[in-house]
């Protein structure tokens, strides 16, 4: 649960402010499977990439979800982009990053991972991302991600980009960034686990 | 169905160039991309690149920047690959292959043979 | 660039036979990966995506299996009409890398 929502936010972060306008422009006309309504306008519009996209999943659900997210990025002409977003969520278990063993389906862990409830936080508030990356790498980041978020000017770009590689990760993964935060920013994990 | 249907095969002297054709049917054109890949005598498949249909945008793989160049009649939902200054070593079978669920190529032209000799 | 390799680059097997076809990519591509089956002097044709997905259509002797960069397609008791050769393939992104190739001959 929770890898069709990261795919879905990772590809609408990824458009260009007037892409995600459009892509809110074509939500409110794309046909809807019956028994589906549609996300108010007035809501939809003053989303941002984080809120439209729990309001997609809350709305359609992850699988549905997807699907109509896809359909909306082909009908904007983003082709590969949707492709890959039929991809990511159409990945079985057996996806888990470099060694790490992905639990049984009965384990399944309800709701959101504490990563994925406080992506927007994390992103904005993470200041030692050399130390989780060194923490992650070998065991959930390969060489050439482990160097393309180090790569990143900033921060929170550097969080972004990490952040990119989420989909594909199973909760053993999160686990395991979430332990690397525990360890080197404590305060911000207590602070998020309290609101 | 989905169909792809390519042009017939074509033989050229080093120099000239090529236009192959890959008209599609049975799907709205626009919403999938149209792949290019390469299959010389006795050789695997090689990737060219693809053009993006609703943008008209193309892109190259390495090997195939310069002398090549991918384009589209939307109206026809046809897409097009040219050679300029044909080689020996541009004889192959060409196939159009449609970018299509999950970025697989999910729908094939029957391939089109181009032999380039003096 | 990811580089995909597949082993054996051929293979002989015999009607009623069980092969497998491995593939290996240069770096974890997860489980995105296809299946392609190319018979003499036709076009390929979409077996498996997203490394175990068997495509509607495809008989199901075929199963793709694996992730991160070790993959396989096993065919179960083997048909006539499963002899040509097959290519694994990335298929998330660019550069939507082939492998070598593997030719599957009749014995």
């Known amino acids: 649960m929770g890898r069709a929502r990261d795919a879905i936010l990772d590809a609408l972060e990824n458009l260009t402010a007037e892409e995600l306008k459009k892509f809110k422009l074509k939500l409110l006309s794309v046909p809807l499977r019956e028994g589906y309504g549609r996300i108010p306008r007035g809501a939809l519009l003053s989303m941002d990439a984080l809120d439209l996209t729990d309001k997609l999943v809350s709305f359609y659900l992850e699988t549905y979800g997807a699907e109509l997210t896809a359909n909306v990025l082909r009908d904007m002409g983003l082709q590969e982009m949707a492709g890959q977003l039929q991809a990511a969520t159409h990945q079985g278990s057996g996806a888990a990053p470099a060694g790490i063993q992905a639990p049984p389906q009965s384990a399944a862990k309800p709701g959101l991972h504490f990563i994925d409830q406080h992506r927007a936080a994390l992103i904005a508030r993470v200041t030692n991302v050399e130390w989780l990356l060194d923490a992650l790498y070998g065991k959930v980041l390969t060489d050439e991600q482990y160097q393309a978020v180090r790569a990143e000017p900033t921060n929170p770009s550097k969080m972004r980009k990490l952040f990119s590689f989420t989909p594909a990760w199973n909760w053993t993964c999160k686990d395991l960034l979430l332990q690397a935060l525990r360890e080197s920013q404590s305060y911000l994990v207590e602070d998020l686990e309290r609101s | 169905q989905i169909q792809l249907v390519q042009s017939g095969p074509e033989l050229k002297k080093p120099g000239e160039t090529v236009k192959i054709s890959c008209k599609a049917s049975g799907y709205t054109f626009t919403k999938y991309g149209m792949n290019w890949v390469k299959q010389a005598p006795g050789k695997g498949l090689k990737r060219m690149g693809w053009?993006?249909?609703?943008?008209?945008?193309?892109t190259y793989s390495d090997d195939f920047k310069g002398r090549f160049a991918f384009s589209l009649e939307t109206s026809a939902s046809t897409a097009y690959l040219q050679i300029n200054n044909l080689k020996n070593d541009d004889t192959a079978t060409y196939f159009c292959?449609?970018?299509?669920?999950?970025?697989?190529?999910?729908?094939w032209g029957q391939g089109t043979t181009l032999t380039v000799s003096s | 660039d990811i580089q995909m390799t597949q082993s054996p680059a051929s293979l002989s097997a015999t009607v009623g036979e069980t092969v497998t076809i491995t593939c290996r990519a240069s770096?974890?591509?997860?489980?995105?990966l296809a299946w392609y089956q190319q018979k003499q002097g036709k076009s390929p044709q979409l077996l498996v995506h997203?490394?175990?997905t068997l495509v509607e259509g495809v008989p199901s002797r075929f199963s793709g299996s694996g992730s991160g960069t070790q993959f396989s397609l096993k065919i179960n008791s083997l048909e006539p009409e499963d002899f040509g050769n097959y290519y694994c393939?990335?298929?998330?992104?660019?550069?939507?890398?082939f492998g070598g190739g593997t030719k599957l001959e009749i014995k």
């Open positions: 393939q990335y298929h998330y992104g660019s550069p939507y890398t």
């Open positions: 997203n490394a175990n």
């Open positions: 292959a449609r970018l299509g669920y999950a970025n697989s190529f999910d729908s």
């Open positions: 053009i993006n249909t609703y943008t008209g945008e193309p």
């Open positions: 770096e974890n591509i997860y489980t995105y």
